[in-house]
Interface confidence: low
């Protein structure tokens, strides 16, 4: 066929940049050289489908489906996925083809299924098929690292008991807070196993491979800081090692560190101590506390003592199985058009959860943020003002959790028109939902004042975009308004907005766009 | 509408302390990171730091690390901006600004409040 | 951190001419496909004021004279008939990340 244009599907895999965001062109992610998925067409199939060659995805991995389209003139484009219509904005390279994307980020199961793409072009109109599997890992395993002492040595080794065999690296950072962040100039990774210097502020272990990366921090008391207003809590899974390490800095070498258990002295062989001078030659004494596999009666509070600094305890909490405590009623937000705003959930959880957002279809990367009271933080503040339906997914080895919020932008509305040889429809969104009002525009009433209300059928909520609702108002035609100028008008809170229409002419007329 | 007003001028010692506050009003003070912004005599501006009111979480610049701290109020809608161990080269005028992140379409400064620190 | 370099430190213009003020960022300040530069006004003894957010998108009540553009690390500020009122301190501001940082400034002054 003659008439059918040139079309080159690929698939470009992206390194995972934890701040990108899923976009339909332009993305900060780094990529690897596209690799094309053939795009043959599909014999048999009713109208014009192309179907690209399968594409297997590993399980958090990001890629973009992309398809350039050499075809004269402007193109205009819909995705579907899973009967949802998704946004698509077409753009043109730098040999004049059309160029469609659709990213993935962080590749999981709800995001696997069939693509299909369509494609209006001045020419013709053609569907595209792609189909996303996620490739079977299923022997593939990242677990949360954890620590035991090395034998007849003061050092720690680092385990994680990954499939395929993970790299771990030692995150030590001598600085407090925000300046521990992981690409601070502060922290030093050290990709090794065993770890001898146990003196730094902040230690983490961490381990990744082709499923990602799990840190464990080493839990630490410090005596010379301020205590929590609220006591820190560790939760272990029965079966885990605890590990607690009590820090404290003198200026010199007398002082002794202990540390008990529901003010009973720990066992000897469930900790040990390490002492070095600083280069300010004050005395620094860490004490670790550790059992290598905790049971329920190792739940309580476990107390530091120093003979020259206040005493400090955390609560250590035994639990049978993972938890992610959050409430979760979906909530419903209601924003100006410019006004800044956050979702946000406040959670419990252990182990450490795993969490998307995701707003129509598109999975968002989500941060935590621990707080002083136990709990942790995400917030989403990346909506760009589009109203909808947004998802908080959690989940870690032993819980899941799932969050709705509705997403509402108050503005006035903006009218677009239909009319056909028997009815003149109007569509607005804006939010709160708008009101419809019909004049009549005739020698009697030149300003359009002439209400109608014969005739007028008004349906809230016809159409639902990702949680947008839309608003129409239709006008049966009657003998009476043939041929005249009519006005439909959409008002809320915000303000009206109206369009004047020719009935008995093919299309809208947009005579006057009252705003 | 959106008004920020700030406490009036203060004159300090060096080594003293100072708190700057910042009443907000026409907007819902918990929706909008509060941000604090200084400005020495003759010279240009110089971000300190920055508040969301919803859950008190802070942003500071390094630079003033350990000598600021910002705290917001939501009962009295009014943020804070506490600066300690003050030196001569402190004297400036500080600003409060409520300021969106991307959508910077409408932002407010307050009037601004200088604070002298001389002997 | 990232630092803002503003060009030029000063620029002697007459009302009626056009001026070009230039910011550049040490690293890129774009992030989810937005430029995150800010451009403000400020004259004596007055807080700043917003004129142009996100690269190129207009503050509120700023008059159409003022225009921005640039992405990445480089980014413009144009006036493209000053007005006696535009003789000013410019700064541009980064909000892409913590510390939020603001350019040295540009002094525009009357020939």
């Known amino acids: 066929n003659q008439d059918l244009p040139v079309i080159k599907c690929v698939l470009i895999n992206h390194k995972n940049n934890d701040s990108s965001v899923g976009k339909s062109s332009s993305y900060p992610m780094v990529s690897e050289s596209p690799e094309d998925l053939g795009c043959a067409l599909r014999p048999q199939s009713s109208g014009t489908v192309y179907e690209a060659a399968a594409v297997e995805v590993d399980v958090s991995a990001s890629i973009t489906l992309q398809v350039l389209v050499d075809a004269p003139g402007n193109i205009s484009c819909l995705w579907v996925f899973k009967h949802s219509s998704l946004n698509c904005q077409p753009h043109f390279d730098l040999q004049n083809r059309g160029v469609v994307s659709m990213v993935i980020l962080k590749m999981t199961e709800t995001q696997a299924g069939e693509y299909l793409l369509f494609i209006q072009s001045e020419a013709t109109n053609y569907t595209i098929l792609f189909t996303v599997s996620i490739r079977n890992t299923l022997l593939y395993t990242l677990r949360r690292p954890y620590f035991r002492k090395m034998e007849n040595q003061d050092a720690l080794v680092c385990i994680s008991e990954s499939v395929p065999e993970p790299i771990v690296e030692w995150v030590l950072c001598d600085s407090q807070g925000e300046s521990c962040k992981e690409e601070s100039p502060a922290v030093v990774k050290k990709e090794e196993k065993v770890l001898h210097e146990l003196f730094g502020t902040d230690i983490r272990c961490c381990a990744r491979n082709e499923l990602g990366r799990e840190c464990t921090r080493l839990f630490t008391i410090d005596l010379n800081q301020t205590p929590q207003t609220t006591l820190p809590q560790l939760f272990l899974k029965v079966g885990e090692p605890l590990w607690i390490r009590c820090k404290a800095v003198h200026v010199n070498h007398g002082f002794g560190l202990t540390w008990e258990l529901e003010n009973k002295a720990l066992e000897e062989g469930n900790y040990f101590e390490m002492s070095t001078y600083s280069t300010n030659r004050t005395m620094i004494r860490i004490l670790f506390a550790f059992v290598s596999s905790v049971a329920r009666n190792d739940t309580g509070y476990y107390t530091c003592s120093s003979s020259k600094h206040p005493s400090q305890s955390a609560l250590v909490t035994i639990v049978e199985k993972g938890f992610i405590n959050a409430t979760n009623s979906s909530e419903d937000y209601e924003i100006d058009q410019y006004e800044e705003f956050c979702f946000s959930v406040r959670f419990k959880a252990y182990p450490q959860i795993r969490c998307t957002w995701t707003f129509s279809r598109k999975s968002f990367p989500c941060e935590q943020k621990g707080l002083d009271n136990g709990y942790s933080i995400s917030k989403f503040c990346n909506h760009k003002h589009q109203p909808g339906e947004y998802i908080f997914h959690a989940e870690n080895d032993d819980a899941q959790f799932t969050k709705m919020f509705t997403l509402n932008i108050r503005r006035k509305p903006q009218v677009l028109a239909e009319a056909s040889a028997s009815q003149a429809s109007c569509f607005s969104d804006g939010y709160p939902l708008p009101s419809w009002t019909w004049k009549k525009c005739s020698d009697k009433s030149p300003n359009c004042t002439e209400e109608i209300t014969e005739g007028v059928w008004n349906r809230k909520a016809n159409r639902k975009v990702f949680g947008q609702w839309v608003s129409s108002s239709t006008l049966n035609m009657s003998e009476a308004i043939k041929g005249f100028l009519v006005k439909c008008c959409a008002y809320n809170s915000l303000g009206t907005s109206c369009e004047t229409i020719l009935l008995n002419s093919p299309g809208p007329f947009p005579f006057i766009q009252d705003n | 509408q959106v008004q920020l007003v700030q406490s009036g001028a203060e004159v300090k010692k060096p080594g003293s302390s100072v708190k700057v506050s910042c009443k907000a009003s026409?907007?819902?003070?918990?929706?909008?990171?509060m941000h604090w912004v200084r400005q020495a005599p003759g010279q240009g501006l110089e971000w300190m730091g920055e508040i969301d009111p919803s859950d008190s979480y802070t942003n500071y610049n390094q630079k003033f690390k350990g000598r600021v701290t910002i705290t917001a109020d939501e009962s009295t809608s009014t943020a804070y901006m506490e600066l300690s161990s003050l030196r001569s080269e402190d004297t400036a005028v500080y600003y409060c600004?409520?300021?969106?992140?991307?959508?910077?379409?409408?932002?407010?400064w307050g009037q601004g409040t200088l604070v002298t620190v001389s002997s | 951190e990232i630092v803002l370099t503003q060009s030029p430190a000063t620029l002697s213009l007459s009302p009626g001419e056009r001026a070009t003020l230039s910011c550049r960022a040490s690293?890129?300040?774009?992030?989810?496909?937005?430029?995150?530069m800010n451009w403000y006004q400020q004259k004596p003894g007055q807080a700043p004021r917003l004129l142009i957010y996100?690269?190129?998108e207009q503050g509120s009540g700023i008059p159409a004279r003022f225009s921005g553009s640039g992405s990445g690390t480089d980014f413009t500020l144009t006036i493209s008939s000053l007005e006696p009122e535009d003789f000013a301190v410019y700064y541009c501001w980064q909000s892409k990340e913590v510390p939020w940082t603001f350019g040295q400034g540009t002094k525009l002054e009357i020939k």
């Open positions: 026409g907007y819902t003070f918990t929706s909008y990171w």
């Open positions: 600004a409520r300021s969106a992140y991307y959508s910077k379409r409408d932002d407010y």
């Open positions: 690293e890129s300040v774009d992030n989810y496909g937005i430029s995150f």
């Open positions: 996100a690269a190129s």
